[in-house]
Interface confidence: low
């Protein structure tokens, strides 16, 4: 489903919208992007509070979500191949819209190391507890979902839209209704700040159609960093109410005339702006003319001002805004240089880590180092990367190619490798024979043994005692492994080409097989056989199990 309900909070120079709907992180980002935003950042406690407020609005509208845990995507992600960095607050994750590593974090729990697949972050709301302001949503990390499966428990997402500035909400001096339409296609009648380029429709009157007047305004940039509606005087004024309705729509003082008309005024130290409603301080610095972290410095006699920038920044051509000095132009790093506000930092490519001689140097990460290897079996470190390999009898498996899966030789593409019984084992296989037949020295064929239909001769074994109930093995049968009395796997073999007549049932006492010539005199019980519907992963044979094993020495029928 798409994104449904939405809520809006605008504060500072950004608006946050919350949407409900089960989408993958990519679909959610795309939705935000279509309207000119990104999945929201949560770079500080203050921003976390803004995001929580917009989620609060959404939850109010949704009335009561039934999930105990609700998750909402935010714009924090880690690309495939980028490993966890426990030393950083963001743990190696980065914000979708770019920007520096930020100090604030609110992780739900310790993160597990994994570099294999892309990971995304959502805000976790525990709806079994009351959602209180002092309890900010935790960050939960997990798979990013896909269009078919957006991610378990994902209820929605939060977008962020940034603007040059905001207009104050329009103040009505009499009955009426304001409807704001924002550049990100949201309509609202109550915004605490209205983003630049928003439209406002004002319908004056108390719902009586004859009396209704309509006004249309646009939030424009009147001067650098000064945003207003271009309206003049309070809206929807009515002699019937004078200053009694919403203080006449005035920012500070409202002065009534005898005829029901009124004017807005300002307190000492403030002046009335061109909209004839809003008051601003007479101190030139009080309107915060300096932007981008610049400090406003009053000139002599408090008449004018200059803007001053912090270290690592310089004033732009407007002399009002600070712009970052790009230290990366001097190439101070060995691999990657990231210019940050007021400074820079060196980064290493995926597969490298900071280290080595010199400032900003990088060295290869040994992914195969002890305790660090992502591979199930063999691991080869390469410059900036690594690759996994498997021992003979196994092939690489898993979506990331780090796992090893046993090759089942008993159902190999070339057909059965054994003349009679075939036993698949972890990383290998071996052949066996039906009662009355013995395994030939080549470990593959069966030759007629003594006339007795008992087990092939060999060293006596504890397990022979009292085990005379045979199991019927029909031609070419496969069966699931059964567990012996001690919990050891008892293998029922795959039967390939029994040399006995096919219509005669074959009764077998518990199987004992002689090991082929590669390992004379080793007696083992088959640990795992091939099963067409094997349940669960196959286990390697335990040291005390008794299976006739093949050597990996290149002989026929062996690996």
């Amino acid at each position: 489903t798409g994104a449904d309900t939405e809520a809006v909070v605008c504060v500072g120079t950004a608006c946050y919208t919350a949407h409900s709907g089960k989408l993958s992180a990519a679909e959610a980002q795309n939705h935000c992007n279509q309207n000119g935003g990104n999945l929201a950042t949560v770079k500080s406690k203050e921003e976390a509070q803004h995001v929580q407020r917009v989620l609060a609005q959404l939850l109010r509208r949704e009335a009561a979500l039934t999930a105990r845990m609700s998750k909402f995507w935010i714009g924090l992600q880690r690309e495939k191949g980028k490993c966890l960095d426990p030393s950083l607050p963001l743990k190696g994750f980065s914000w979708v819209g770019g920007g520096e590593d930020t100090p604030y974090s609110n992780w739900h729990k310790e993160l597990r190391n994994s570099c294999i697949s892309k990971r995304c972050v959502s805000l976790l709301l525990d709806l079994s507890q009351p959602l209180l302001p002092s309890r900010l949503p935790k960050w939960s990390e997990g798979p990013c979902g896909s269009p078919g499966s957006p991610g378990s428990n994902i209820e929605g997402f939060v977008c962020k839209f940034s603007f040059k500035g905001m207009c104050r909400p329009l103040a009505l001096g009499g009955p009426g209704q304001v409807t704001y339409t924002t550049p990100f296609q949201t309509t609202s009648s109550s915004l605490e700040a209205v983003p630049f380029a928003s439209a406002a429709n004002v319908a004056c009157g108390e719902g009586d159609k004859d009396e209704t007047q309509s006004h249309y305004f646009l939030c424009k940039e009147k001067a650098p960093d000064v945003f207003d509606w271009g309206s003049s005087g309070p809206l929807c004024v009515s002699p019937k109410y004078g200053c009694n309705f919403n203080n006449g729509g005035c920012h500070q003082d409202c002065f009534e005339g005898g005829d029901g008309s009124f004017l807005c005024g300002c307190r000492p130290g403030f002046r009335l702006l061109d909209d004839l409603v809003t008051c601003a301080s007479r101190n030139p610095c009080s309107s915060s003319p300096c932007r981008g972290g610049a400090t406003c410095v009053l000139g002599p006699h408090g008449k004018n001002y200059t803007c001053r920038c912090p270290q690592g920044y310089q004033l732009d051509s407007s002399q009002l805004d600070c712009v970052d000095v790009d230290e990366c132009q001097d190439s101070p790093c060995a691999q990657e240089c990231v210019n940050t506000p007021g400074g820079f930092r060196c980064e290493c490519w995926v597969g490298y880590e900071p280290g080595g001689p010199g400032e900003g140097a990088c060295q290869d990460v040994d992914e195969c180092a002890l305790g660090r290897s992502p591979c199930a079996q063999g691991c080869t470190n390469t410059d900036g990367s690594f690759h996994c390999s498997c021992e003979e009898g196994y092939v690489l498996a898993g979506e990331d190619g780090t796992q090893c899966q046993d090759v089942d030789e008993c159902v190999g593409p070339g057909g059965p490798l054994c003349d009679s019984l075939c036993f698949n084992t972890q990383g290998s296989f071996h052949c066996g024979c039906l009662p009355g037949w013995v395994l030939a020295p080549n470990g593959v064929s069966c030759t007629m043994g003594p006339v007795s239909l008992g087990p092939p001769s060999g060293p006596p074994d504890e397990e022979d005692k009292g085990e005379k109930e045979g199991s019927t093995v029909p031609r070419a049968a496969t069966a699931s492994p059964t567990r012996g009395p001690e919990g050891t796997p008892k293998a029922t073999p795959t039967t390939s080409r029994p040399s006995l007549s096919s219509d005669a049932p074959i009764t077998s006492a518990p199987l004992k097989m002689l090991a082929p010539s590669g390992s004379p005199g080793v007696w083992r019980e088959p640990s795992i056989h091939h099963a067409t519907a094997a349940s669960g992963p196959q286990e390697p044979a335990g040291g005390d199990s008794s299976v006739a094993t093949q050597n990996n020495d290149g002989t026929d029928g062996q690996k």
Epitope: A63, A64, P130, P133
Partner: antibody, heavy 120, light 111 residues
């Protein structure tokens, strides 16, 4: 109109339990949390906990944890508060009150109260 | 727990005069620009009634002689012109943190 109607007065012995009910009407029962607040004779107000009638989630004041149980019956739009191991200190008027789902959870509608007297 | 302290404990004011009740929280009850502080009125034998929420917002149906102000830890409830029906106990309450806590109450009487 919006109303919360509580069950009648109760007299209990120390060590016993009491179960007070609060029936809601005039609004969507599942869209508001329901709280329980008590007031001992001549004393102030004390918040005991709350229940989300939608999913039956509860959240209790630690002071009452283990002794208080809040439940709800969606079909009859009724919430219940059971307090166990009563002592004379639990003699009070018990109020149910509703609050918005999230944010400033002020109590905009209150029940008339149920007087519980614990006496041997 | 956040402790809410009301002052005075009781207040006697002449009809038509201003009554002012203070409420102090042991820590800030502000969050994201809002104060999570509410005022209730309780008359004898009745449940409390919401007067003001979020420090200064008048609940619908409450006379506008009641007003609230303050932020952070210090809050005030003002009755601009006391009427006979305003005789009651007034409680402040914070909803910023668990457990939700109330002040001890201020009894308003007519002088």
């Amino acid at each position: 109109q919006v109303q919360l109607v509580q069950s009648g007065a109760e007299v209990k012995k120390p060590g016993a339990s009491v179960k007070v009910s609060c029936k809601a009407s005039g609004y969507t029962f599942t869209s508001y949390w329901m709280h329980w607040v008590r007031q001992a004779p001549g004393q102030g107000l004390e918040w005991m906990g709350e229940i989300d009638p939608s999913a039956s989630y509860t959240y209790y004041n630690q002071k009452f944890k283990g002794r208080v149980t809040m439940t709800r019956d969606k079909s009859s739009s009724t919430v219940y508060m059971e307090l166990s191991s009563l002592t004379s200190e639990d003699s009070a008027v018990y109020y149910c009150a509703r609050s918005v789902y999230y944010g400033n959870k002020y109590f905009d509608v209150w029940g008339a109260g149920t007087t519980v007297t614990v006496s041997s | 727990d956040i402790v809410m302290t009301q002052s005075p404990d009781s207040l006697a004011v002449s009809l038509g005069e201003r009554a002012t009740i203070n409420c102090k929280a042991s820590q800030s009850v502000d969050y994201a620009g809002d104060s999570y502080l509410n005022w209730y009125q309780q008359k004898p034998g009745q449940p409390p009634k919401l007067l003001i929420y979020a420090a200064s917002n008048l609940e619908s149906g409450v006379p506008d002689r009641f007003s609230g102000s303050g932020s952070g830890t210090d809050f005030t409830l003002t009755i601009s012109s006391l009427q006979a029906e305003d005789v009651a106990v007034y409680y402040c309450q914070q909803t910023n943190e668990d457990p939700r806590t109330f002040g001890g109450g201020t009894k308003v009487e007519i002088k």
